[in-house]
Interface confidence: medium
């Protein structure tokens, strides 16, 4: 709805959910269905985003805010505002141009998205492998023989997994 109009710019007082209709003496007209204006002073309302196909509606469009989409089961969001949906893979796999492929030996992926990452190299920290890695899990590093003095910790957690370069938000 229109508020008291400014003498300088009548459009500045049109609130969210309306547009300043130049064809009608700069009156604040409500946004038509399937359109919105999220800020005041708009000269037009924007068309609502439609969540079709692999996208599904997470939040309906209203007169003041756009619809928000996410992805149907088996897919996950990529990009700002879920601009793309990417196919899920199983743990122990990564998505390639030819579809989901098992992680190569020496790499793992513990998520349904992202890329396979190399197992932690325990020896770089002077540790030994306590539990072997798999396609789905990183190795668990244990103490080196020199660490086996009384009171020493017997297990250190694996290095934190790095986020893949194209991980979703």
């Amino acid at each position: 709805f229109e508020r008291t109009r400014s003498l300088q710019d009548p459009c500045s007082n049109c609130p969210a959910g309306t547009f300043c209709d130049n064809n009608r003496n700069q009156i604040c007209s409500p946004c038509p269905p399937n359109s919105f204006s999220s800020a005041g002073g708009q000269r037009t309302c924007d068309i609502c985003r439609q969540c079709k196909g692999v996208f599904r509606t997470r939040k309906e469009c209203s007169s003041t805010s756009n619809a928000e989409c996410d992805c149907t089961p088996g897919f996950h969001c990529l990009g700002a505002g879920c601009s793309m949906c990417e196919q899920d893979c199983k743990q122990g796999q990564e998505l390639t141009k030819k579809g989901c492929k098992d992680c190569c030996f020496g790499t793992f992926n513990d998520q349904k998205r992202g890329i396979c990452r190399p197992w932690t190299n325990c020896s770089l920290d002077g540790k030994s492998v306590l539990v072997n890695g798999t396609k789905e899990r990183d190795v668990v590093c244990g103490p080196s023989p020199a660490d086996l003095s009384p009171g020493a910790s017997s297990v250190t957690p694996p290095a934190p997994a790095r986020e893949p370069g194209h991980s979703p938000q």
């Epitope: 709805f1 229109e2 609130p15 959910g17 007209s29 946004c31 038509p32 003041t64």
Partner: antibody
Framework: QVQLVQSGSELKKPGASVKVSCKAS????????MHWVRQAPGQGLEWMGW????????TYADDFKGRFVFSLDTSVSTAYLQISSLKAEDTAVYYC?????????WGQGTLVTVSS | DIQMTQSPSTLSASVGDRVTITCKAS??????VAWYQQKSGKAPKLLIY???IRHTGVPSRFSGSGSGTEFTLTISSLQPDDFATYYC?????????FGGGTKVEIK
């Protein structure tokens, strides 16, 4: 589901004040403005004004400037209507209504009776 | 302020009848008109917005039409649940104004 639940009926004496509450649930309170509508006994609907639930800024219809105040407590998703210096002619049912492309959901109404 | 004039003010009809209520605006309000139904002692319910779009859950027997200054609410086959008062409202500009109401009663 969207629900607006208003406070119960009030019986007040002329000159007193009353505060009517409207508790919203089932949606994000600050995404939609809240409007207030009055209906006197046996009469039609009269728009009183609205409040921007994001900024708290109220807008009042000409006939409701002065003694009528809209306010919010966003922490409990509640809008309020306060009427001061009550008069007999304020006797009416007061409704809150969420606004999207129209007043799409309404509270059940609060009857305010002003009588000496 | 924009005046919304509804007619008739009272309408007697029977179950199964086709009912038409009209609303005239004192000036052009584009398609920014809504229709509400109110039963005795209850809050109004939105039926139609933007002149012709049914609100969620509203039965298809309710339809709206018109633009500019003349608007119509039609109930194609009146049901027992439809005996109520109906209001039009322009929401083109502030203040949004309601029509005086049309009471649909049993003949």
């Amino acid at each position: 589901q969207v629900q607006l639940v208003q406070s119960g009926s009030e019986l007040k004496k002329p000159g007193a004040s009353v505060k009517v509450s409207c508790k919203a649930s089932g949606y994000t309170f600050t995404d939609y403005s809240m409007h207030w509508v009055r209906q006197a006994p046996g009469q039609g609907l009269e728009w009183m004004g609205w409040i921007n639930t994001e900024t708290g800024e109220p807008t009042y219809a000409d006939d409701f400037k002065g003694r009528f105040v809209f306010s919010l407590d966003t922490s409990v998703s509640t809008a309020y209507l306060q009427i001061s210096s009550l008069k007999a002619e304020d006797t009416a049912v007061y409704y809150c209504a969420r606004y999207d492309y129209a007043m799409d959901y309404w509270g059940q109404g609060t009857l305010v009776t002003v009588s000496s | 302020d924009i005046q919304m004039t509804q007619s008739p003010s009272t309408l007697s009809a029977s179950v199964g009848d086709r009912v038409t209520i009209t609303c005239k605006a004192s000036q052009d309000v584009s398609s920014a008109v809504a229709w509400y139904q109110q039963k005795s002692g209850k809050a109004p319910k939105l039926l139609i917005y933007w002149a012709s779009i049914r609100h969620t859950g509203v039965p298809s027997r309710f339809s709206g039409s018109g633009s500019g200054t003349e608007f119509t609410l039609t109930i194609s086959s009146l049901q027992p649940d439809d005996f109520a008062t109906y209001y039009c409202q322009q929401r083109y500009t502030t203040p949004p104004t309601f029509g005086g109401g049309t009471k649909v009663e049993i003949k």
